[in-house]
């Protein structure tokens, strides 16, 4: 195991356990957690007499790092006394050192309440030149606080000669003020008001607060997807709201149909991003045959910092329809990465819009996160295309040489899905891993250079083309083909590609 | 049927202060945002300010300041606090109630109340 | 802050007429855009919301369209009634800007 450096712990009894006319007292400090072997534990009794014993060092069963107890037992006027614990820890460091100072026992205690608040702004909502801000720390059982000013964590020098502090009933309240030039408050910097009692540490933060017209929260309802609705048959829709600025107020999202029937119960999810906004999803079960029928869901948002509510409502797509056309094809071995191959599937001139894509191998449908699938995108007609692209291995074409790729859409009949099968070595019987068989035909064209594929950006042959080596049980133009014009007076060149 | 009635409208000196009134009904005032919008005699409407269902609020960028606007759910009202009143305060002051979609719109309007500011 | 440019800033039509408004804002909006009616002496009149939802009880000779930055209400055969001050209104939850309303058409009889 690596070196590790211990946390020390005190350990202390409670006051009301120990008996007043009790004439001496144990206390202890635990080193936990370090590696390697040993550690020093020295005591600092100020003016009392005190024995220490250090107990032999346990291992940990989980992670084989050490602990160790030292126990110190003083007699005399303990009750007002501090002690430290001072616990060294040479394989980390020749000066690697942890205090802990604290009191023989500890009391039930009453824990402060931290809240900073802030000057006002003037009356035209503009920043003053400087702007206080003030630590409430309240409610605690009397006793020592330490007051700390970070700004952006790092500790400020602050006097803190103005705090104040003031006792009602049985409890205190402190206060500490900073003040800061407005420039140092628009930096868009925190100030954390840190309090220290009784070995614990307390705090509230603030900063110059966003503009209060938010900006850019946006709401987005998705339909179900084709897959969730026509082949698991158990569709749901999802709310998204996102660039929230994260507060105290929770978003409430309200589901209702417009149909004014029941909803079911839908499940919801809270998610802080990485530039500090928050993302909340819910996600609403819908009946198959409502959707189908034309039902209207709608997601209303409310927040605290959302001026107006906002409602998103989906419904199915209304328009024509068109089944899609599915190609699968898979791309020529590549210099280099022969245990690899790449496979394509376009999928075009469907409409509405709403398709999923799968791809199966084996009759097994491969994972989501395999294939990576455009969004739709408009024809230069009336309907949409995708790309789907999948990575496969040799293990798995020498495995079996087929995998699938399957559109599911409404309009795809009889049973809403569209599949074709693609193999990485078209023609090889069991899908043995060979070279890539040799074209049987010939593409003249003019115009093109020998060996280029002429429908890199997405055009088709010739049309005096003809396509051949498809499979015949293929409606439609097959996956991974060579196509032949006859020449005229050309030099004869090959494109293995899509038809 | 949904009804909003403003009030407090009239005479004013620049300078001085007025507190506008919405009266809601047959609604639950609590499920709604609500908005003011003021009028200037021949021009086009101009957004004052809108608080939320939870009472929070927000103001056109030149009302920030003089324009208060707050909500009592528990007596179905609506105000509008205007401070340091000037000649250019003086319009049709319209409370109205936004839909409770949302982000859509103002269903209702009130008659509205007529501020005038002069010496 | 998103500004709101309505033209033309008025109108001559005939009954029967077809009359389209259009209103440009300054930048996309994403929530709803609202159209309102106004009669001299009375409050405005919802007349679509959501860019394109007609409101409740507005004759169907009334449509929206838009989105992004150019949204359009369209009357599709004006009536005696439709005379009157039309004013778009982004209800955009996510901008305050200094004026949310459109500077307003009027329709007058040609």
């Known amino acids: 195991a690596s070196t590790q450096s211990p946390s020390v712990f005190p350990l202390t009894r409670c006051c009301k356990n120990i008996p007043s006319n009790a004439t001496s007292v144990t206390l202890g400090c635990l080193a936990t957690g370090y590696f390697p072997e040993p550690v020093m534990v020295t005591w600092d009794t100020g003016s009392l007499n005190g024995t220490t014993m250090t107990l032999p060092a346990t291992t940990l069963t989980l992670s084989g790092h050490y602990a160790t107890i030292s126990l110190l037992t003083v007699s005399g006027a303990w009750a007002k006394q501090m002690f430290t614990c001072r616990v060294a820890h040479t394989p980390s460091s020749t000066d690697w050192v942890d205090n802990k100072t604290f009191s023989v026992c500890s009391r039930d205690f009453t824990p402060p309440t931290v809240k900073i608040l802030q000057s006002s702004c003037d009356g035209g909502g503009h920043f003053p030149p400087t702007i206080q801000l003030l630590c409430l720390v309240s409610g605690y059982t009397p006793g020592t606080i330490n007051i700390t000013w970070l700004e952006d964590g790092q500790v400020m020098d602050v006097d803190l000669s103005t705090a104040s502090t003031t006792q009602e009933g049985e409890l205190a309240s402190t206060q500490s003020e900073l003040t800061l030039s407005q420039k140092h408050w628009l930096s868009d910097r925190t100030y954390t008001c840190q309090v220290t009692y009784q070995g614990h540490t307390f705090e509230d933060s603030t900063k110059k607060c966003a503009d209060s017209n938010p900006r850019g929260v946006s709401a987005y309802l998705s339909r179900p997807s084709p897959f969730d609705l026509f082949i698991r048959k158990s569709p749901t829709i999802t709310c998204l709201v996102v660039d929230l600025a994260p507060s105290k107020g929770t978003v409430n999202l309200t589901w209702s149909r417009a149909s004014g029937k029941p909803v079911n119960h839908s499940t919801r999810k809270e998610e802080k991003q990485r530039n500090g906004t928050l993302t909340v999803t819910s996600t609403l079960p819908v009946g198959t045959r409502d959707w189908i029928e034309g039902e209207t869901y709608q997601c209303r948002v409310t927040h605290p910092h959302l001026p107006r509510a906002l409602m998103r409502s989906t419904t199915k797509t209304s328009g024509p329809r068109a089944a899609p056309e599915v190609y699968a094809f898979a791309t020529p071995e590549w210099p280099g990465s022969r245990d690899k191959r790449t496979l394509a599937c376009l999928i075009q001139n469907f409409m509405p819009e709403d398709i999923s894509v799968q791809w199966l191998h084996n009759e097994v449908q491969l994972p989501d996160a395999r294939h990576s699938t455009t969004q739709p995108r408009k024809t230069k007609g009336s309907g949409f295309f995708v790309f789907s692209r999948l990575e496969v291995t040799r293990a798995e074409w020498e495995q079996k040489d087929e995998f699938i790729c399957r559109a599911v859409h409404e309009a795809a009949s009889p049973s809403q899905t569209v599949q074709r099968a693609v193999s990485v070595n078209p023609g090889l019987a069991g899908g043995s891993a060979q070279s890539q068989r040799a074209p049987d035909r010939v593409l003249c064209h003019s115009g093109q250079q020998q060996g280029l594929p002429r429908a890199a950006g997405g055009s088709v042959p010739h049309p005096r083309c003809h396509c051949g080596a498809g499979r015949a049980d293929w409606p439609g133009p097959p996956e991974l083909d060579v196509c032949v014009e006859e020449a005229e007076g050309e030099a004869p060149w090959t494109w293995t590609g899509l038809c | 049927q949904v009804q909003l009635v403003e009030s407090g409208g009239g005479l004013v000196q620049p300078g001085g202060s007025l507190r506008l009134s919405c009266a809601a009904s047959?609604?639950?005032?609590?499920?709604?945002?609500m908005t003011w919008v003021r009028q200037a005699p021949g021009k086009g409407l101009e957004y004052v300010s809108i608080i939320n269902t939870y009472g929070n609020h927000w103001y056109a960028n030149w009302a920030s300041g003089r324009f208060t606007i707050s909500r009592d759910n528990s007596k179905n009202t609506v105000y509008l606090q205007i401070d340091s009143l000037r000649a250019g305060d003086t319009a049709t002051y319209y409370c109205?109630?936004?839909?409770?979609?949302?982000?859509?719109?103002?269903?209702?309007w009130g008659q509205g109340t007529l501020v005038t500011v002069s010496s | 802050d998103i500004q709101m440019t309505q033209s033309p800033s008025s109108v001559s039509a005939s009954v029967g007429d077809r009359v389209t408004i259009t209103c440009q804002a300054s930048e996309s909006i994403y929530s709803g855009l609202a159209w309102y009616q106004q009669k001299p002496g009375q409050p405005p009149k919802l007349l679509i919301y959501?860019?394109?939802t007609l409101a409740s009880g507005v004759p169907s000779r009334f449509s929206g369209s838009g989105s992004g930055t150019e949204y359009a209400l369209t009357i599709s055969s004006l009536q005696p009634e439709d005379f009157a001050t039309y004013y778009c209104?982004?209800?955009?939850?996510?901008?305050?800007?200094?004026?949310?309303f459109g500077g307003g058409t009027k329709v007058e009889i040609k």
């Open positions: 209104q982004h209800a955009d939850y996510a901008h305050h800007s200094d004026n949310v």
């Open positions: 047959g609604f639950t005032l609590s499920n709604h945002d």
């Open positions: 109205a109630r936004e839909t409770h979609h949302g982000s859509s719109g103002i269903d209702h």
């Open positions: 959501d860019h394109s």
